[in-house]
Amino acid sequence: MEVTVPATLNVLNGSDARLPCTFNSCYTVNHKQFSLNWTYQECNNCSEEMFLQFRMKIINLKLERFQDRVEFSGNPSKYDVSVMLRNVQPEDEGIYNCYIMNPPDRHRGHGKIHLQVLMEEPPERDST
């Protein structure tokens, strides 16, 4: 299984961020067997906190840090397990992991996104 995510995602403070995570598999998605975990890490060697799961249905774990700002925006049948994070704050900076199991595929897919929160719009690059 191959997972596609952006290595880094730069998001403006206060805006909404789509954390994209897509995968390809030799097998169609069977919702009874398919599983998904999204986790958050504050730093590279910090422990992971799970904030969203898919086990036949989406389970939003309502981590205190995200309150009600996370929602599932993907479609597993279309190999898309992306999530939306609303009103991004500096406290949201860190590492977001998506883990995917799609039996009978035996390999667990893993995507890692480094989220950086920008405090202001970056200056436009001179194209000349």
Epitope: E42, C43, H114, Q116, M119
Partner: nanobody, 116 residues
């Protein structure tokens, strides 16, 4: 790998001042932003201040006009000067760093207690 070590915390009376330091070591050349966060017992972490490589600074509303973040690149150190401290500033203060490659690092923190 980057290491961050904070110091300068302690017990201070309301209205007093403290200066926190965060020394970075290891591969520090690609660090783009340095932040101070704080976490009070039983609460989520809270952003305090940020300084970019270019020296731009940003503050949480709750500390504006009272706290000043600065950096000394020659000493690989970021400072947080905290003035007019209030009891609600009591927390573990820790620094974090982000690299150009998107890696995130954090220190263990230094405890600040403000008594009334």
């Amino acid at each position: 790998e980057v290491q961050l070590v904070e110091s300068g915390g302690g017990l201070v009376q309301a209205g007093g001042s403290l200066r926190l330091s965060c020394v970075t070591s290891g591969r520090t050349s690609d660090l783009s932003t340095m932040n101070w966060f704080r976490q009070a017992p039983g609460k989520e972490r809270e952003f305090v201040a940020r300084i970019t490589r270019r020296g731009s600074t940003y503050y949480a509303e709750s500390v504006k006009e009272r706290f000043i973040i600065s950096r000394d690149n020659a000493k690989n150190t970021v400072y947080l000067q905290m003035n007019s401290l209030k009891p609600e500033d009591t927390a573990n203060y820790y620094c974090t760093a982000a690299s150009e490659m998107g890696y995130h690092y954090r220190g263990q923190g230094t405890l600040v207690t403000v008594s009334s």
